[in-house]
């Protein structure tokens, strides 16, 4: 069977006026997954995103991440899109003071 991922979105200061938003998926099986940032509903081009390898996390499941740099104040236009085993979910960027968004996709 499949194990759905936990998805966690974080933000960190990058350069002046920019932030880096990172979307991490963990504890999923099988290893096939789509993880990408979307702006205004549409997937960003590959060259504006950085991906981590899909790696075993020691429990027979896998983990990976995707990050992109965006203008501060435009966070709400972005969502992390996750697709795994025929299911999808979307994950917005938390507001400034809160640094994570956990979602276990069913």
């Amino acid at each position: 069977g499949s194990v759905p991922p936990m998805v966690n979105v974080t933000r960190s200061e990058a350069s002046e006026g920019n932030i880096t938003v990172t979307c991490r998926a963990s504890s999923f099986y099988p290893r096939n997954i789509t993880l990408t940032w979307r702006q205004d509903g549409v997937s960003l081009s590959h060259d504006t995103q950085q991906w981590g390898d899909v790696l075993p996390d020691g429990n027979g499941t896998y983990q990976t991440w995707v990050a992109t740099r965006i203008c501060q104040g435009e966070e709400q236009r972005f969502t992390c899109y996750m697709e795994h085993s025929g299911n999808h979910s979307t994950h917005p960027v938390p507001s400034g003071n809160s640094h994570h968004h956990h979602h276990h996709h069913h």
Epitope: G41, Q76, R77, F78, T79, E83, G86, H88, T90
Partner: antibody, heavy 117, light 107 residues
């Protein structure tokens, strides 16, 4: 301009199935998620689920997981909502909508479903 | 699931008056809130998104505000065409949930 054109009203018997359609035009159909919403008189609005028309991947409200099935046909730019084992509780207006990042920017006109013997 | 509590359920106001509708979320929704207007027999129309951004073509007499768990929609100088029902919806997490609605009647 962006348009979502839904199929017409349906009168169906309890226990049967029905398929509601939502034809998109004016934009790249496979680029945006399509959402489905249920509205019953006096009961407000309920999110049923969403489909990625490009891949067919779905996201269901747990409440509707065993009742609704979402599909999409890329060749005709049409999304579908199928219901099985219909009961009177399924009588409602069903809307499709486009997901523009983090809100629904365009809605279909609604399809009225009446389940009655 | 995040519950959205909207108030009042209905209101009656005169043309030119200012009215305010509120929505309270059961958890922090980080300003991922939209407001819709719906006329009888029609589909909802987007008014405000991200809690305070006006959708294209929406008159400036409408304004949204709020953060965390508390949000409001204000209509300045109510016009006859503003009658109908208003709904809030949160987009922080699925299932996306709606407020119960506010029916606005013109006196």
């Amino acid at each position: 301009q962006v348009q979502l054109q839904q199929s017409g009203a349906e009168l169906v018997r309890p226990g049967t199935s029905v398929k509601v359609s939502c034809k998109a035009s004016g934009y790249a159909f496979t680029n945006y998620l399509i959402e489905w919403v249920k509205q019953r008189p006096g009961q407000g609005l309920e999110w049923i689920g969403a489909i990625n028309p490009g891949s067919g991947a779905t996201n269901y409200n747990e409440k509707f997981k065993d009742k609704a099935r979402l599909t999409a046909d890329k060749s005709s730019n049409t999304a579908y909502l199928q219901f099985s084992s219909l009961t009177s509780d399924d009588s409602a207006v069903y809307f499709c909508a486009r997901f523009l990042g983090n809100y629904f920017d365009n809605w279909g006109q609604g399809a009225t479903l009446t389940v009655s013997s | 699931d995040i519950q959205m509590t909207q108030s009042p359920a209905s209101l009656s106001a005169s043309v030119g008056e200012t009215v305010t509708i509120t929505c309270r979320a059961s958890g922090n929704i980080h300003s991922y809130l939209a407001w819709y207007q719906q006329k009888q027999g029609k589909s909802p129309q987007l008014l405000v998104y991200y809690a305070e951004t006006l959708a294209d073509g929406v008159p400036s007499r409408f304004s949204g505000r709020g953060s965390g768990t508390q949000y409001s929609l204000k209509i300045n100088s109510l016009q006859p065409e503003d009658f109908g029902s208003y709904f809030c919806q949160q987009f922080w997490t699925t299932p996306y949930t709606f407020g119960g609605g506010t029916k606005v009647e013109i006196k």
